[in-house]
């Protein structure tokens, strides 16, 4: 099949003890190969501080996955989610307030 670029969105969980969990989700992409990872201060966040979901079929012939990490509340600006899929690159900031979601579709 032809390439279908991912829809990427970044969400924040509830705060606990000054920390928040930020999750970056990629969905509706094809083919299955994708890079999804967090950057802190513009460089790679160490792998042992990130959790990845499996790349799973979403029922439409496309795939979905996620990566999450815990960060200090108030330091959201320092983190971005980096996505690479079929030669397509994108970076996605953490929304500044817990109620916001960032959605990006890559073309």
């Amino acid at each position: 099949g032809s390439t279908v670029p991912p829809m990427v969105n970044v969400t924040c969980s509830e705060v606990s003890e000054g920390n928040i969990t930020v999750t970056c989700r990629a969905s509706s992409f094809y083919p299955r190969n994708i890079t999804l990872t967090w950057r802190q201060d513009g460089v790679s966040l160490s792998h042992n501080t990130q959790q990845w979901g499996d790349v799973l079929p979403d029922g439409n012939g496309t795939y979905q996955t996620w990566v999450a990490t815990r960060i200090r509340q108030g330091e959201e600006q320092r983190f971005t989610c980096y996505m690479e899929h079929s030669g397509n690159h994108g970076t996605h900031p953490v929304p500044s307030g817990n109620s916001h979601h960032h959605h990006h579709h890559h073309h």
Partner: antibody, heavy 119, light 107 residues
Framework: DVQLQESGPGLVKPSQSLSLTCTVT?????????WNWIRQFPRNKLEWMGY???????NYNPSLKSRISITRDTSKNQFFLQLISVTTEDTATYYC????????????WGQGTLVTVSA | DIQMTQSPASLSASVGETVTITCRAS??????LAWYQQKQGKSPQLLVY???MLADGVPSRFSASGSGTQYSLKINSLQPEDFGSYYC?????????FGAGTKVEIK
């Protein structure tokens, strides 16, 4: 557009301190980004020295950690480099630059200022 | 620290030729690579980020590729304004480090 301009003495004596200023126009250094110092030695080797970010957090190259300090004056939208106990090996062109948090590459640099360490 | 090794250190080429500069990292930098051009007496200028993405305003005769530890910058049909020095820089981790540079001279 973000513009950066370095300034400071062009000549420093060995064992003294080197102090440089980067004046930023077109963007507030407290809004976002990491504000960096990079130097280029006479044989053109480039070395990342460190940064101060929008919130005042610093990060230094371990090779310089005991000698370097980066500070800022938010009222003047300036950030500063201080390097203590300099030797002739610190002779270089010093650049200020910044990067956004989508990746630590440097989209714009100041014009650079040559600092010579000599008795 | 990750060391960046550039080759060749210098090359001579004629206008209209194609040249390729390579950069090898001492560890896997996962496409966290930038390229810069520097003219004599001027500041470096960003050409490429994320290993393959051309910065705004960079002519399409420039292209970049690579993965893992090996990266390259290619200039098709070299123009007079392309002469100067080229540097790679990784941003996988701190400290950020640069290659020693490749000087492209007129034959």
């Amino acid at each position: 557009d973000v513009q950066l301009q370095e300034s400071g003495p062009g000549l420093v004596k060995p064992s003294q301190s080197l102090s440089l200023t980067c004046t930023v126009t077109g963007y507030s250094i407290t809004s976002d980004y990491a504000w960096n110092w990079i130097r280029q030695f006479p044989r053109n080797k480039l070395e990342w020295m460190g940064y101060i970010n929008y919130s005042g957090t610093t990060n230094y190259n371990p090779s310089l950690k005991s000698r370097i300090s980066i500070t800022r004056d938010t009222s003047k939208n300036q950030f500063f480099l201080q390097l203590i106990s300099v030797t002739t090996e610190d002779t270089a062109t010093y650049y200020c630059s910044y990067y956004r948090y989508d990746g630590a590459w440097f989209p714009y640099w100041g014009q650079g200022t040559l600092v010579t360490v000599s008795a | 620290d990750i060391q960046m090794t550039q080759s060749p250190a210098s090359l001579s080429a004629s206008v209209g030729e194609t040249v390729t500069i390579t950069c090898r990292a001492s560890g896997n930098i996962h496409n966290y690579l930038a390229w810069y051009q520097q003219k004599q007496g001027k500041s470096p200028q960003l050409l490429v980020y994320n290993a393959i993405m051309l910065a705004d305003g960079v002519p399409s005769r420039f292209s970049a590729s690579g993965s893992g530890t090996q990266y390259s910058l290619k200039i098709n049909s070299l123009q007079p304004e392309d002469f100067g020095s080229y540097y790679c820089q990784h941003f996988w981790s701190f400290p950020l480090t640069f290659g020693a540079g490749t000087k492209v001279e007129i034959k």
